[in-house]
């Protein structure tokens, strides 16, 4: 069971990143699915290595003082969502914006029906060029 | 099937990074090989988790305006090469240069004879000190 | 065999990071253990994908000129410790400090009784907020 999906620009104002089965994507079988373009949902309980990579372009003067934060989050059936992993990068002083990349990854127990998704502080800063931003998992 | 190879400084002017089976490297068996010191080639079709880490040292004034980009690329038999993953980091203002590290990783389907390699915008900026720059894969 | 542990602030002056089985941690069975809150020790020989993520907050003026370096290290029975992976990030000019995240990961052969741990140049700069700093492994 494995998946690797590709970032998709979105007109939605949500902080949850959008993904698509496009380009050189992976969706090994129907035991993992991409739901609503925003979350990877697994049908089998078990340990999974889950990862995300986010490239963004931001400028210190044009952004809030808070850093750019990417969060890998879990939503299990009947439970509140929770943060699994986070990474933070202070905005660049480069103009018009400076690109930076974040990589998140870890091993987590997922229940049947559990979903994982990626949240960022400012989706408009995310880079969607080939290979820059992706999200995936593999069952151990 | 797994491999982990170590960066090697090169006098070549190519943007493709060079690697060696040295230090604490891994080459599990002959189903994965390091070819020409530049690409990991697999003999079996399947899903692989492929990763690369690149540490580099650059300075904004001494570099081009474009960011430092590391790309994980795929060359399948009979096909053109393609980008699987990319990460970008704007150059530092630190002098003489500021070190930064990039990590790439994802799950991809590889065909028999497929090769993966790492390309960077400026190989002269890559750090080859112990542990700083490496490249590997594992078959799921 | 898999583990994922969560960073723990420590009053110790050691450069070795401290970890805990807290929050959404993973410890699959007793073939991998967290020893003294500082190292993951495995009982079985084999290939392991080992990873660490460290988020830190630093300022160029308040820090030494040397970059922030995170090292993934191995201690095998009867041998001196060795560096497996390192990542470096130059300190930010943001005030009071600028957050940055480092991710390390690779495939390595571990002997029975081998331990892996994470070393940083300045533990006081490490961010221990939910999800920011973690450490784990999985047996292939």
């Amino acid at each position: 069971i494995a998946a690797h999906v590709i970032s998709e620009a979105s007109s939605k104002t949500t902080s949850v990143l959008q993904w698509a089965e496009k380009g050189y994507y992976t969706m090994s079988n129907n035991l993992v699915t991409l739901e609503n373009g925003k979350q990877l949902t697994v049908k089998r309980q078990g340990l999974y290595y889950i990862y995300a990579q986010v490239t963004f372009c931001s400028n210190r003067e044009a952004s809030s003082q808070a850093p750019f934060i990417a969060s890998l989050c879990l939503k299990s059936p009947g439970r509140f969502e929770r943060i699994l992993l986070r990474a933070a990068n202070t905005h660049s002083s480069a103009k018009p914006c400076g690109q930076q990349s974040i990589h998140l990854g870890g091993v987590f127990e997922l229940q049947p029906g559990a979903s994982v998704f990626v949240n960022v502080t400012d989706p408009s800063q995310v880079s969607h060029g080939t290979g820059f931003t992706s999200f995936g998992l593999l069952k151990l | 099937i797994a491999a982990h190879v170590i960066s090697e400084a090169s006098s070549k002017t190519t943007s493709v990074l060079q690697w060696a089976e040295k230090g604490y490297y891994t080459m599990s068996n002959n189903l994965v090989t390091l070819e020409n010191g530049k690409q990991l080639t697999v003999k079996r079709q399947g899903l692989y988790y492929i990763y690369a880490q690149v540490t580099f040292c650059s300075n904004r004034e001494a570099s081009s305006q474009a960011p430092f980009i590391a790309s994980l690329c795929l060359k399948s038999p009979g096909r053109f090469e393609r980008i699987l993953l990319r990460a970008a980091n704007t150059h530092s203002s630190a002098k003489p240069c500021g070190q930064q590290s990039i990590h790439l990783g994802g799950v991809f389907e590889l065909q028999p004879g497929a090769s993966v390699f790492v390309n960077v915008t400026d190989p002269s900026q890559v750090s080859h000190g112990t542990g700083f720059t490496s490249f590997g894969l594992l078959k799921l | 065999i898999a583990a994922h542990v969560i960073s723990e602030a420590s009053s110790k002056t050691t450069s070795v990071l401290q970890w805990a089985e807290k929050g959404y941690y993973t410890m699959s069975n007793n073939l991998v253990t967290l020893e003294n809150g500082k190292q993951l020790t495995v009982k079985r020989q084999g290939l392991y994908y080992i990873y660490a993520q460290v988020t830190f907050c630093s300022n160029r003026e308040a820090s030494s000129q040397a970059p922030f370096i995170a090292s993934l290290c191995l201690k095998s029975p009867g041998r001196f410790e060795r560096i497996l992976l390192r990542a470096a990030n130059t300190h930010s000019s943001a005030k009071p400090c600028g957050q940055q995240s480092i991710h390390l990961g690779g495939v390595f052969e571990l002997q029975p009784g081998a331990s892996v741990f994470v070393n940083v140049t300045d533990p006081s700069q490490v961010s221990h907020g939910t999800g920011f700093t973690s450490f784990g492994l999985l047996k292939l």
Epitope: - | G23, G131 | V16, S76
Partner: nanobody, 123 residues
Framework: EVQLLESGGGLVQPGGSLRLSCAAS????????MSWVRQAPGKGLEWVST????????YYADSVKGRFTISRDNSKNTLYLQMNSLRAEDTAVYYC????????????????WGQGTLVTVSS
Amino acid sequence: EVQLLESGGGLVQPGGSLRLSCAASGFTFEGYPMSWVRQAPGKGLEWVSTISPLGPDTYYADSVKGRFTISRDNSKNTLYLQMNSLRAEDTAVYYCAKLLMGEYLNSRTFDYWGQGTLVTVSS
């Protein structure tokens, strides 16, 4: 290019103290175990002490145990040997030496040496 440069030697009276330093360059200092080795006049090489890469673990020859202390400052790429209660038999040229990464704890196999610094203990 790997370089090891010792300093701090000199003439000292029995019972006195000296601190030797070894400045390292050309390699990832914090990745390697480091040792002090000495050679008394007309004698062979004698291992004195070894320190692990990150510094928590130290090992000493019986002849110096309790009198000498090995330490390192990885931020300065420097190895030290604090020598107290010096005796005439400690007179020797002291060399700083680098071991291989991940080497066995009891290894005495060195791949690089310094030029040495002379310590003379005499009244």
